[in-house]
């Protein structure tokens, strides 16, 4: 809980709290916005973001998203509010441990974004197929 | 007994600096992350930096970013912020607490996570 010399505020965000009143910790996050990128046409990549950053409000997830169009290749990585859309998409695997990327419908670009909740989950962007737990044969590999 | 100690808060000019220290006993210090969080008057918490129990990576919110600088003497049991820069946004209460490898939520104890605090106030 906050303890009681810490004072309570009114309707912030800033932190979140459980019934019993214990602290949430925040995420750590790769936080470079959107830099270009030479990830292409691998089962997994790095971010090369230099800068890991403490999420504003402990309720944010780490996300990433890729994207290539005819000119060139971006990769954004940011906190994010997993309550609210990004680019439009809602962050359906945000509990995720690992930053599996699924690809998006956008015109006229290949858009893929993953989000996760781990610290720096984002760091290591996962395109491979084989590391998606959806995946009846990956299940029946885990549970040999 | 848990004990989280501030100190070295005070009063300064905008651009001014400021160190803050946090002594840590009754723990094991090098078995946990560190942090500092801060509290401006009437807002909520706002976590500021943290620093790894070995190898000292170091993390800092966007706001403090390249301005402040944490670090950690774990011969002494002591946590510091150095503040540089200093603006009136970053006039706040400012807490040491502690955070075990994997924990995600800070248990409801008044001694056991947080210090007293202590008070930096920036103005002119």
């Known amino acids: 809980t906050i303890p009681p010399h810490v004072q309570k505020s009114v309707n912030n965000d800033m932190i979140v709290t459980d019934n019993n009143g214990a602290v949430k910790f925040p995420q750590l996050c790769k936080f470079c916005d959107v830099r270009f990128s030479t990830c292409d046409n691998q089962k997994s990549c790095m971010s090369n973001c230099s800068i890991t950053s403490i999420c504003e409000k402990p309720q944010e997830v780490c996300v990433a998203v890729w994207r290539k169009n005819d000119e060139n290749i971006t990769l954004e990585t940011v906190c994010h509010d997993p309550k609210l859309p990004y680019h439009d998409f809602i962050l359906e695997d945000a509990a995720s441990p690992k930053c599996i990327m699924k690809e998006k419908k956008k015109p006229g670009e290949t858009f893929f974004m993953c989000s996760c909740s781990s610290d720096e989950c984002n760091d290591n962007i996962i395109f491979s197929e084989e590391y998606n737990t959806s995946n009846p044969d990956l299940l029946l590999v885990i549970f040999q | 007994e848990v004990q989280l100690l501030e100190s070295g808060g005070g009063l300064v000019q905008p651009g001014g600096s400021l160190r803050l220290s946090c002594a840590a006993s009754g723990f094991t210090f090098t078995e946990y992350r560190m942090w500092w969080v801060r509290q401006a008057p009437g807002k909520g918490l706002e976590w500021v930096s943290a620093i790894e129990p070995i190898g000292n990576r170091t993390y800092y919110a966007r706001s403090v970013f390249g301005r402040f600088t944490i670090s950690r003497d774990n011969s002494k049991n002591t946590l510091y912020l150095q503040m540089n820069s200093l603006r009136a946004e970053d006039t706040a209460v400012y807490y040491c607490?502690?955070?075990?490898?994997?924990?995600?939520?800070?248990?409801?104890?008044?001694?056991?996570?947080w210090g007293q605090g202590t008070l930096v106030t920036v103005s002119s």
């Open positions: 607490a502690k955070q075990m490898p994997g924990q995600k939520w800070m248990a409801k104890s008044r001694f056991d996570y």
